[in-house]
Amino acid sequence: LVPHLGDREKRDSVCPQGKYIHPQNNSICCTKCHKGTYLYNDCPGPGQDTDCRECESGSFTASENHLRHCLSCSKCRKEMGQVEISSCTVDRDTVCGCRKNQYRHYWSENLFQCFNCSLCLNGTVHLSCQEKQNTVCTCHAGFFLRENECVSCSNCKKSLECTKLCLPQIENVKGTEDSGTT
């Protein structure tokens, strides 16, 4: 099966790699602009230079292109706890990330929020915190996992899933309640 190509991809495939077809004259292949630059004017004829200009501050192109405008630099979302890992340059977008001991939770493909890694208090670290995944905790006896935190079995209600994990504790509590002195 041949993948569906857009008009621009169809036009570009006529020219060798690193070149694109002139929009007004499909017999001319112009050289693409280097990353960090954008297309100011198409090449006037075969073998003649494409007029490429450097991206202005606050914009970039990360690969060779024939874009009429550079792309705007991304801004890290402070409200999501993001910090700037590296600034935008003419050939690379801003890189955003999280602080130490935090992980990314992706709300959608390009939108993430930073959350603190769980410390596994009253438990042990089963899997360490990763860039995109919280710590996985294993709880000590007498504790159960709720929302990735180890909670005392004394907070386990009969209706919750914790009853299986906390069953010995629940039995013990019942046992001590039942055993009255005679």
Epitope: S74, H105, Y106, W107, S108, E109, N110, L111, Q113, F115, E147, N148
Partner: nanobody, 124 residues
Framework: EVQLLESGGGLVQPGGSLRLSCAAS????????MAWVRQAPGKGLEWVSF????????YYADSVRGRFTISRDNSKNTLYLQMNSLRAEDTAVYYC?????????????????WGQGTLVTVSS
């Protein structure tokens, strides 16, 4: 067909409370993050709060943090927003929104379906 139906809006005095609900249908509710987004009169859209599919991760705008609480009941396919200590500046149309499938969302507009909205008016 995806449907999101908000309810619970109305007129409330400053300092009062309201609970908004959003009944979802036409998709597997428990597999998607959900959100509340609002639009004040003459203003743009503002992200209010998000909740992930299991309710483990939440986001609150600075303007509502500590006053609003987002929650969901996956067994009832319903999203909630408990709004306390309401202020005049909370007056807006509140929309329930579904996060787009992971690969089809984008940073500026990560939602693919919206409800019709419910009006919240905070006034004395």
């Amino acid at each position: 067909e995806v449907q999101l139906l908000e309810s619970g809006g109305g007129l409330v005095q400053p300092g009062g409370s309201l609970r908004l609900s959003c009944a979802a249908s036409g998709f597997t509710f428990h597999k998607y993050g959900m959100a509340w987004v609002r639009q004040a009169p003459g203003k743009g859209l503002e992200w209010v709060s998000f909740i992930d599919l299991a309710g483990l991760h939440t986001y609150y705008a600075d303007s509502v943090r500590g006053r609003f609480t987002i929650s969901r009941d996956n067994s009832k396919n319903t999203l909630y927003l408990q709004m306390n200590s309401l202020r005049a500046e909370d007056t807006a149309v509140y929309y329930c929104a579904k996060f787009a499938t992971y690969s089809s969302g984008n940073e500026e507009q990560p939602f693919d379906y919206w409800g019709q909205g419910t009006l919240v008016t905070v006034s004395s």
